[in-house]
Amino acid sequence: MVPEEEPQDREKGLWWFQLKVWSMAVVSILLLSVCFTVSSVVPHNFMYSKTVKRLSKLREYQQYHPSLTCVMEGKDIEDWSCCPTPWTSFQSSCYFISTGMQSWTKSQKNCSVMGADLVVINTREEQDFIIQNLKRNSSYFLGLSDPGGRRHWQWVDQTPYNENVTFWHSGEPNNLDERCAIINFRSSEEWGWNDIHCHVPQKSICKMKKIYI
Amino acid sequence: LGEPQLCYILDAILFLYGIVLTLLYCRLKIQVRKAAITSYEKSDGVYTGLSTRNQETYETLKHEKPPQ
Amino acid sequence: LGEPQLCYILDAILFLYGIVLTLLYCRLKIQVRKAAITSYEKSDGVYTGLSTRNQETYETLKHEKPPQ
């Protein structure tokens, strides 16, 4: 017959078991606490660094855009898309109608100092949006030019010029010396593009990507 | 990793931990219940069995007549 | 409430749930071990007693000679 275990040993074994179990519990709780702390502290730091990043990003724009109008993108409170306050937004871009009259080069320069370019029109929907804000008796420079005068039209942002997505007035472009494009209103055809001399001052349309903060 | 992503990952870890521990807890609880029932049956059976066995023995002793 | 806020609330709930369940599980584990030890001690007595008693019965039966 196996000699019987002493109650003292049995108690000792139970005590060791208890110690092991509670140690496991403490380790588990510690791990959970670490997880929870990470979940609470890291996002706080992340939020802080994100805020710092946002502020520096906003500071970049502040020189020319002292105030931004922002809308929440999707459901996430973190994602805001902004346009400078007087600008209008459409899809992923912001638009500004410059009422000052300038040559094409100056108009492009004017847009660029605001962190934008002369407008590049990619779709009919985009043009339809833009024309809502234009005056019928004015002409506006587009970011489209033919620097060599050889009918190789190019957009300022290097977007490929697609003949199928152009909205020239009938008979335009019609002059090799007219190397810059404007959008204007003609009673017969409504809004469309025309080629003109680049040095003649016109109003213009600037376009920039939305600012995401 | 973005802030929400981190939160969701930790959510998932805590959630899995909760599920695993819930299952372990339930399994242990069931084992305890089973053990209790088994233990009850066993202890019952020991005494019942004993009494029966004794009874049988007794009966046998009682009814078994020696050859005369 | 925003999505991230909800996530943190869920985090807190799961965290507390995890802690409570960890404690419950560990307590149950120890209870089971204690119960096993207690049960072991008890069952040990039962079987020892039985075995002795059977032995005695057996011996009694064995040595008890019928009258001739």
């Epitope: 100056k106 001399h197 001052p201 | - | -």
Partner: antibody, heavy 120, light 107 residues
Framework: DVQLQESGPGLVKPSQSLSLTCSVT?????????WNWIRQFPGNKLECMGY???????YYSPSLKNRISITRDTSKNQFFLNLNSVTTEDTATYFC?????????????WGQGTLVTVSA | DIQMTQSPASLSASVGETVTITCRAS??????LAWYHQKQGKSPQLLVY???SLVDGVPSRFSGSGSGTQYSLRINSLQPEDFGSYYC?????????FGGGTKLEII
Amino acid sequence: DVQLQESGPGLVKPSQSLSLTCSVTGYSITSAYYWNWIRQFPGNKLECMGYITYDGNNYYSPSLKNRISITRDTSKNQFFLNLNSVTTEDTATYFCARGGDYDDGGFAFWGQGTLVTVSA
Amino acid sequence: DIQMTQSPASLSASVGETVTITCRASGNIHNYLAWYHQKQGKSPQLLVYNAKSLVDGVPSRFSGSGSGTQYSLRINSLQPEDFGSYYCQHFWIVPYTFGGGTKLEII
């Protein structure tokens, strides 16, 4: 070489209209550039009044918008200034000039100017 | 409108001297500045465009400089034909306004 020449009455009565002509030679006003009217007051201050572009569009200085009109006669290669309701304040030397040279960086070609006095 | 402030209003110098005329814009005109010289009874003549580019035929003693809102015209070794009035004009955005002028006189 392009040349510009202003012409018109040297004396205009207050409340009347001032009309001037700029005749351009050596370049067609419908080919390119924009064609300006500029005036210089007796104190030598210079003011851009407005222009007509090669394709016939106009720009007028905001301070003159209600009184000014710039037109052209393409067959004669001339453009015109009309200023209504003149006062003695409109006494000045009136110049025409071509705009758009040097990528619109300066007026390279000017007329010799014509003095207009507004007086009763 | 962008306002142009020119200084000094008048300046006296002798032949061979060097003079500097300054022009301040009320806003950034991004180097779109022209300088003119006008003699009594004549029309202004373009000397400098885009702040520092000299028109063909203009003597190299004339030089333009500056950026943003501050610009200047420097005339080295003054010649008798350089006397008269000087005007700056910005070409950044219509209307293209002129400075008040600087009258350069001979001593």
